[in-house]
């Protein structure tokens, strides 16, 4: 997250970190069910661990943390690397979470976002770009949903209805390491960090997010079919 600020503790209990060995964060994710996460499809890896209820990026033990294995990864069937359409994936955890103030699911919004909606994006991704500098703790950033026209103007021929753009002023954006993390608007999950320009936070080049309102049926049906 570029030019965000430290999230208040306990305010993002649905935020997950996807980790490679040894404790290497590569993507964010979102708890949407006691045993299921949503993340970006481009975050798919064979072997990874899931950390929930953790505030700092470092692997130091925190009393609220819960660790899991991903036992099943189900990318949306319409996703195809290196494209960005349909960029979402469900991950089944090896067991159900223990609900606490630090670990709790969030509901996925069935309403599509309108331009001007204020949202919060969070993650442990780099705070500088193109340099790489990671934060000590989870970062939060207020962003506004942009109109689809502004989105298409920013990225000609690259935007479809499975995406929406959001941003703030130049210099504020999600970035590498934030993929799959939550965009929360009006208390529900509206999007996932997906892609954007490089370096991050360039003028008139907003972040692009997976438009989850288009996928509520697929999410529900997939969880039911695999539970």
């Amino acid at each position: 997250i570029i030019n965000g600020s430290d999230c208040d503790m306990h305010t993002q209990p649905w935020q997950a970190a996807l980790l490679l060995r040894p404790n290497q964060l590569y993507c964010g994710a979102v708890l949407v069910h006691p045993q299921w996460l949503l993340t970006a499809a481009h975050c798919r890896k064979k072997v990874f661990r899931v950390r929930l209820g953790h505030y700092s990026l470092s692997p130091v033990y925190e009393s609220g943390q819960q660790m899991f294995q991903g036992v099943k990864s189900i990318p949306h069937p319409g996703y195809s690397h290196p494209g960005h359409s349909n960029d979402l994936m469900l991950i089944k955890l090896n067991r159900r979470i223990r609900p606490t103030k630090d670990v709790r699911p969030i509901n996925v919004s069935s309403h599509c976002p309108s331009a001007g909606t204020k949202c919060l994006v969070s993650g442990w991704g780099t705070t500088k770009s193109p340099q790489v500098h990671f934060p000590k703790v989870l970062q939060c950033l207020n962003i506004s949903v942009l109109s689809q026209k502004r989105c298409e103007d920013a990225y000609p021929r690259q935007i479809d209805d499975t995406m929406f753009c959001a941003g703030d002023k130049a210099g504020r954006d999600s970035c590498q390491g934030d993929s799959g993390g939550p965009v929360v608007c009006n208390g529900s999950l509206q999007g996932l960090v997906s892609w954007g320009d490089y370096p991050c936070a360039r003028p008139n080049r907003p972040g692009v997010y997976t438009n989850l309102c288009k996928f509520t049926k697929w999410i529900q049906e997939t969880i039911q079919a695999n539970s």
Epitope: L20, Q24, L25, Y26, C27, A40, H42, C43, K45, P82, G83, H84, G125, T126, P130, Q131, V132, S174, C175, Q176, G177, D178, S179, G180, V193, S194, W195, G196, D197, Y198, P199, C200, R202, R205, G207
Partner: antibody
């Protein structure tokens, strides 16, 4: 078949210019960042330049900064390297290489260069 | 810039031998290291990415390990087609830099 084919190499005098081209086929060229890498006779690999998929980010090795310019035309599936003020030490085989890392995607995961051309030889000599 | 130091610069080995090549970065690069194989007159070929992930089509006798500053490429049982030069490359930080190379020769 995924393929990169370089062209444009040749013999040039010190201070001269050359333009290298790299034609891509078999993949969605506009979705990938690209690199130029060179190898002087009997020496190791030296990274020369990088260009992101949308051309929004470009970087160069210090040894070529201010003299070389990387560019691309996604509509033509082509990558270019304009080389000016050439020096004897620029003599090398020049490879274009596809970068498997998508800097547009916001995961923190880096791969490397997975597809390389056969190379084109640049000789700078009087 | 990050310096990549490979050792040894050359190694003589026989078919069936276990060969280990090391690469050291001048600063931490997490797991973001790639290994390449290059045969004379040919372009390099990606073998391993993210320090330990095998690129599609690469034989399982090749393996990589390490994180931070110290990395290793291991060929568990050297085959005739493995005689080549091997390079490491750090990929997260510009300028990208390669190690000096390790030539694996027939003993």
């Amino acid at each position: 078949e995924v393929q990169l084919v370089e062209s444009g190499g040749g013999l040039v005098q010190p201070g001269g210019s050359l333009r290298l081209s790299c034609a891509a086929s078999g993949f969605t060229f506009g979705s990938y960042a690209m690199n130029w890498v060179r190898q002087a006779p009997g020496k190791g690999l030296e990274w020369v330049s990088y260009i992101s998929s949308s051309s929004s980010f470009i970087d160069y090795a210090d040894s070529v900064k201010g003299r070389f310019t990387i560019s691309r035309d996604n509509a033509k599936n082509s990558l270019y390297l304009q080389m000016n003020s050439l020096r004897a030490e620029d003599t090398a085989v020049y490879y274009c290489a596809r970068d498997l890392t998508s800097m547009q995607s916001r995961d923190y995961y880096y791969y490397g260069m997975d597809v390389w051309g056969q190379g084109t030889t640049v000789t700078v000599s009087s | 810039d990050i310096q990549m130091t490979q050792s040894p610069s050359s190694v003589s080995a026989s078919v069936g031998d276990r060969v280990t090549i090391t690469c050291r970065a001048s600063q931490g690069i997490s797991s973001w290291l790639a290994w390449y194989q290059q045969k004379p007159g040919k372009a390099p070929k990606l073998l391993i990415y993210a320090a330990s992930s095998l690129q599609s089509g690469v034989p399982s006798r090749f393996s990589g390990s390490g994180s931070g500053t110290d990395f290793t490429l291991t060929i568990s049982s050297l085959q005739p087609e493995d005689f080549a030069t091997y390079y490491c490359q750090q990929v997260p930080i510009f300028p990208y830099t390669f190690g000096g190379g390790t030539k694996v020769e027939i003993k």
